[in-house]
Interface confidence: low
């Protein structure tokens, strides 16, 4: 039996700058039961704290709730792996919440074929921002991207929607069934996952003629 291998903190993400979660990969366990603890201190402080919540983020994770999350202070964190033979430590990881935001996917994706009498027909796509994000304060700017493709096609067609929460698409293949998804990202941070796909049948008489 050996002391445990070196763990690695490989990812930290925040859904909204108010909370965040970090995940680590355990090293080898040295053939013995191994306990993991995450400790951290804030920039300029020497007092160490233990992870406030090992449950919410799933296995090998640490979740920082609202009361533990500060925008203005860098977190310096480390994972300690301990078994009967000894302890091993991850490299220290420096986390600034501003740069790890990954929102939840947009909600309430609605897709509709519009065929006005006097204009070209189009596909109208509408969605809502994720609930955890409060856009009214101006604290967040969310950007959106739409992707769609005929059901049996391999390639996605991608449209950047900017900050708007609805979008029109004119060029579509009549008679095809399309999959539509939307995702979002903050001005600094990561794209969300794609929303669940919404399906829409394009009528056979959908025409692009003037």
């Amino acid at each position: 039996q050996l002391p445990p291998g070196k763990p690695e903190i490989f990812k930290c993400r925040s859904p909204n700058k108010e909370t965040f979660t970090c995940w680590w990969r355990p090293g080898t366990d040295g053939g013995l039961p191994t306990n993991y603890s995450l400790t951290y201190h804030r920039e300029g402080e020497t007092l160490m704290h233990e992870c406030p919540d090992y449950i919410t983020g799933g296995p090998n994770s640490c979740h920082f709730g609202k009361q533990y999350t500060s925008m203005w202070r860098t977190y310096i964190m480390m994972v300690n792996a301990t078994n009967q033979m000894g302890s091993s430590f991850s490299d220290e990881l420096y986390v600034d919440v501003t740069y790890i935001v990954q929102p939840d996917p947009p909600l309430e994706l609605a897709v509709e074929v519009k065929q006005p009498e006097d204009r070209k027909p189009y596909l109208w796509i509408k969605w809502s921002p994720p609930t955890l994000i409060d856009l009214k304060t101006g604290w967040f700017t969310l950007l959106y991207e739409i992707r769609l493709k005929p059901e049996k096609a391999a390639e996605w067609e991608i449209h950047f929607a900017g900050q708007q929460t609805e979008f029109k698409i004119l060029s579509l293949h009549p008679g095809q069934k399309y999959l539509v998804q939307v995702r979002c990202k903050p001005d600094h941070g990561y794209w969300s996952a794609w929303s669940p796909a919404t399906f829409i049948q394009i009528p056979s008489d959908f025409t692009m003629n003037d």
């Epitope: 300029g44 402080e45 420096y94 101006g138 604290w139």
Partner: antibody
């Protein structure tokens, strides 16, 4: 006594360079984030740059980004500010300040300042 | 132009109470701690209030800070001649990733 002492200021031509130093004493320098703040003659305070205790996190004001470089030598208890491509608008008294450990983001100790004239 | 807005001047007579305001936005005062600094003529700034309303040791309890929404204020009661100075508010700005200061308020004791 906790003290910060800046040096390296002086008169420099536009486009020139200067390196400011800030010698710290009376506290464990390597445990604290450090900052540079400047004050143009007759004007208010302007934050310039910050560096974390281990130099892993560094921030700059947009007005100096790409021209100024903050660094520190924890073994010498010294903070530096390398200023390149200096402009007339960089003329100011430059203060170094300590990031307050328990004091919620405050700059709790300030040096006496060093004057840079471009 | 400063990100945080302060009145350029304020005045009062000895013994009076004076308040200095500091207005910001959701990305600085609205979501982070406010700090106040005092700068006496010809000297370096000195920390006066941190964490919205906390006084470092050595600062008289005549000085108090408060914060509401995206604004903050510094109150000085029992004004004294030695309080004549420039006062600056400051906060971390999460959108700019840096500290922002108010333009400063020159306090005159009449």
């Amino acid at each position: 006594e906790v003290q910060l002492l800046e040096s390296g200021g002086g008169l420099v031509q536009p486009g020139g360079s200067l390196r400011l130093s800030c010698a710290a004493s009376g506290f464990t320098f390597s445990s604290y984030a450090m900052h540079w703040v400047r004050q143009a003659p007759g004007k208010g305070l302007e934050w310039v740059s910050s560096i974390s205790s281990s130099s892993s996190s560094i921030y700059y004001a947009d007005s100096v980004k790409g021209r100024f470089t903050i660094s520190r030598d924890n073994s010498k208890n010294t903070l530096y500010l390398q200023m390149n491509s200096l402009r007339a608008e960089d003329t100011a008294v430059y203060y170094c300040a300590r990031g307050g450990g328990q004091q919620l983001g405050a700059f709790d100790i300030w040096g006496q300042g060093t004057l840079v004239t471009v | 132009q400063s990100v945080l807005t302060q009145p350029p001047s304020a005045s009062g007579t000895p013994g009076q109470r004076v308040t200095i305001s500091c207005s910001g936005s959701s990305s600085n005062i609205g979501s982070n701690f406010v700090t106040w600094y005092q700068q006496l003529p010809g000297t370096a700034p000195k920390l006066l209030i941190y964490g919205n309303n906390n006084r470092p040791s050595g600062v008289p309890d005549r000085f108090s800070g408060s914060k509401s929404g995206t604004s903050a204020s510094l109150a000085i009661s029992g004004l004294r001649s030695e309080d004549e100075a420039d006062y600056y508010c400051a906060a971390w700005d999460g959108s700019l990733s840096g500290w922002v200061f108010g333009g400063g308020t020159k306090l005159t004791v009449l």
